[in-house]
């Protein structure tokens, strides 16, 4: 009985031979749990896993902490691949994050962090980056130093109120800061003026919602 | 859908005064905060006042502290920015812009920019002789 080959990452899937975008499965080492991610093995060379997506507003991103660690949605559509399996992957060696954006006038820009990781649930999951570079503002929309994760019922922001509730999703909220890819989806000349929407403040300004995003991880120096 | 249109700007001679209008819509005053901005050709946009809490809490910056003062009427949806002693310097395209009042960071009274999610389009105010 042959060994079973398995892949922590797209970018293990790539340099394994298979080089064509699609869903793959994935298994962290020594683990037996298995997610299902979009890997992009066309974009700036390829191996990207694919960890969140929204594009038409099909799925519903006001999801409780435990969707949000264990991931929802299609990934071959929307989804959250899920912080549990990202924290780990990223505690385990260096990852690149790169957020690629899509505004309604056919506009496009990205941000690349040249380090990423989550903490772990303990730790609500904290967001840490480095280095940031790319079109889609100089200065980064995901609050610095990161924020912990919260969910609509799981408040770990440092606001009076509770964004995750008053803005829709799960993100790293700071008070509640200049960026939620998770926001409502609202569709094209609906979508300024949003106080909930999908914003990313240093490249389209407030109350913006986007037409499309992908946050895609890849080990530093793939 | 909401909206915020201002209104009141014109061309005003140094000392003069004028008073610009922010009618809201699509929302109601009581539970967010309205903040006054401006920006000048060439320079970044910054703010000037702001009102939440039914005029129960307001904010000035120190360049207008003492000339401009800011209020509503909760039931016109409006708020207002009553500017005096106007000089060269306060010419701008002035815009209001609203965020929920609950937006706030533990321990602090005032929203950075960012959390401003909604947007008039502005009213152009000169000052000149």
């Known amino acids: 009985k042959g060994e079973q080959i398995s892949f922590r990452d797209c970018a293990e899937v790539f340099k394994s031979g298979h080089t064509t975008n699609g869903v793959y499965t994935l298994t962290l080492p020594n683990s037996t749990e298995e997610v299902k991610a979009y890997c992009d093995m066309e974009a700036g060379g390829g191996g990207w896993t694919i960890i969140q997506r929204r594009e038409d507003g099909s799925v519903d991103f006001q999801r409780t902490w435990k969707e949000y660690k264990v991931g929802f949605g299609n990934p071959s559509g929307e989804y959250w691949l899920g912080n549990e399996f990202v924290s780990q992957l990223t505690n385990q060696q260096r990852y690149v994050l790169k957020i690629h954006l899509k505004d309604w006038e056919g506009n496009e820009a990205y941000s690349l962090y040249e380090h990423f990781y989550l903490s772990s649930e303990e730790l609500n999951y904290r967001i840490h980056l480095k280095g940031l570079t790319g079109t889609a503002g100089k200065i980064s929309s995901i609050s610095q130093p990161g924020n912990d994760f919260s969910t609509k019922d799981a408040d770990n922001d440092k606001c009076i109120c509770k964004c995750s509730q008053m803005l829709t999703g799960g993100w790293w909220f700071d008070a509640c800061g200049p960026s939620n890819l998770n926001g409502m989806y609202y569709p094209q000349r609906q979508n300024t003026n949003k106080f909930n929407g999908i914003k990313w403040y240093y490249w389209k300004g407030s109350g913006y919602s986007l037409k499309g995003t992908t946050m895609m991880i890849r080990p530093a120096g793939f | 859908e909401v909206q915020l249109v201002e209104s009141g700007g014109g061309l005003v001679q140094p000392g003069g005064s004028l008073r610009l209008s922010c009618a809201a819509s699509?929302?109601?005053?009581?539970?967010?905060?309205i903040g006054w901005f401006r920006q000048a050709p060439g320079k970044e946009r910054e703010g000037v006042s702001a009102?939440?809490?039914?005029?129960?809490?307001?904010y000035y910056a120190d360049s207008v502290k003492g000339r401009f003062t800011i209020s509503s009427d909760n039931s016109k949806n409006t708020v207002y920015l009553q500017m005096n002693s106007l000089r060269p310097e306060d010419t701008a395209v002035y815009y209001c812009?609203?965020?929920?009042?609950?937006?706030?960071?533990?321990?602090?009274?005032?929203?950075?920019?960012?959390?401003?999610?909604?947007w008039g389009q502005g009213t152009l105010v000169t000052v000149s002789s």
């Open positions: 699509g929302f109601t005053l009581d539970d967010y905060a």
């Open positions: 009102i939440r809490d039914n005029g129960g809490s307001t």
């Open positions: 812009a609203a965020v929920p009042a609950g937006r706030l960071r533990f321990g602090e009274q005032w929203y950075p920019l960012y959390e401003y999610d909604a």
